[in-house]
Amino acid sequence: ALDAAYCFRNVQDNCCLRPLYIDFKRDLGWKWIHEPKGYNANFCAGACPYLWSSDTQHSRVLSLYNTINPEASASPCCVSQDLEPLTILYYIGKTPKIEQLSNMIVKSCKCS
Amino acid sequence: ALDAAYCFRNVQDNCCLRPLYIDFKRDLGWKWIHEPKGYNANFCAGACPYLWSSDTQHSRVLSLYNTINPEASASPCCVSQDLEPLTILYYIGKTPKIEQLSNMIVKSCKCS
């Protein structure tokens, strides 16, 4: 799996999970989240060469098509596969509120 | 939706469905499929600018992050959303066999 266990341990130009820390205030302009101040969002990036972690039949076909037609622009792309929520604390006036924001953290990637 | 109805009607540089016909023999080197000779596989391509058809909370956050941090390389990518199967006819010896290959045709795209 193209997850932290594999990608953070290996120098990998191909599609892999990349570390990305987002500071809510500095990077998003969000002042409304009290805790955490930021989080490890991560992202997916890298080349999708022939059959590298192909996700669907279509992406495998596309991968093969590109090998035979190298001038083609129709190549798979490195995107998130597994995502996890992030629990945040914010205030509605003076009242603290805990909320789970879905699909905020990328855990693994795929070529799609 | 970034589907044929929208994308094939509009000239769109951003993430959209693109037409792609794949000839099994010529483009994939597959001689084993008897019918059809090829099919409209389509593919997804184009830029994913600020919140263009963002798929998940993470891709929206990433989109906002890129707007505020334009030097960042952590941008969403244009990939397939809805896929459909393709029915094929092939032969096992002299015996015709009909098979449905899942996820062979891209019907719409998203920024993920």
Epitope: K31, E99 | V61, L64
Partner: antibody
Framework: DVQLVESGGDLVKPGGSLRLTCVAS????????MHWVRQAPGKGLQWVAY????????YYADSVKGRFTISIDNSKNTLYLQMNSLKTEDTATYYC?????????????WGQGTLVTVSS | DIVLTQPPSLSVNLGQTARITCRAS???????LAWYQQKPGQAPKLVTY???SRAPGIPDRFSGTNSGITATLTISGARAEDEADYYC?????????FGQGTKLEIK
């Protein structure tokens, strides 16, 4: 320069529907919580609803809950207020406003307002 | 809901000090109140917020204080252009509420 421009106000019959639009420019739209506030003719200000961009957390005043829907198109820098089952007491000038940063906060920029008249 | 009570009107002489009060039905804390100025046919404009912060572009003759229950907007040396409706707003608790407004007349 920060600008908020509302549109969509009209004369509508009781029970009718209307959609208000607020287009923002001059700042990173998705960074600030957005509110709708209304003002009945000759009366004071009344808060209607808010939405947090990107995460789409919304909250409503009891008087409009179940009838009004606040929504946002982050990519178009646009805030909406879908108003259904309108009552005569909904007659007001509707303003969109952004907060300084927190969910409940002072509102540093307001639109010019759009007039909604509910009358038979 | 928190109720904010303001006097309906206030009249002061040109150049005098105007003090507009806003009384809350429960303690807000010092940082959860804002004041707005609204002129006829215009949108409200933020004047002060928080404990005593002035909004950008607001002249320093405007100042706000807040004890938790009673907030005061003070206009030192009132000018003709300060004639307007003034609203207090609390954001300590949901829902956000506004006072009924005070019409300030400059004589």
């Amino acid at each position: 320069d920060v600008q908020l421009v509302e549109s969509g106000g009209d004369l509508v019959k009781p029970g009718g529907s209307l959609r208000l639009t607020c287009v923002a420019s001059g700042y990173t739209f998705s960074s600030n919580v957005m509110h709708w506030v209304r003002q009945a003719p000759g009366k004071g200000l009344q808060w209607v609803a808010y939405v947090i961009p990107i995460v789409d957390i919304a909250y409503y005043a009891d008087s409009v809950k179940g009838r009004f829907t606040i929504s946002i198109d982050n990519s178009k820098n646009t805030l909406y207020l879908q108003m259904n089952s309108l009552k005569t007491e909904d007659t007001a000038t509707y303003y969109c406003a952004r907060t300084l940063g927190l969910v409940l906060d002072a509102m540093d920029y307001w639109g010019q307002g759009t007039l909604v008249t509910v009358s038979s | 809901d928190i109720v904010l009570t303001q006097p309906p009107s206030l009249s002061v002489n040109l150049g005098q000090t105007a003090r507009i009060t806003c009384r809350a039905s429960q303690s807000l804390g010092s940082s959860y109140l804002a004041w707005y100025q609204q002129k006829p046919g215009q949108a409200p404009k933020l004047v002060t917020y928080g404990a005593s912060s002035r909004a950008p572009g607001i002249p320093d003759r405007f100042s706000g204080t807040n004890s938790g229950i009673t907030a005061t907007l003070t206009i030192s040396g009132a000018r003709a252009e300060d004639e307007a409706d003034y609203y207090c707003q609390q954001y300590a608790d949901s829902p956000i509420t506004f006072g009924q407004g005070t019409k300030l007349e400059i004589k």
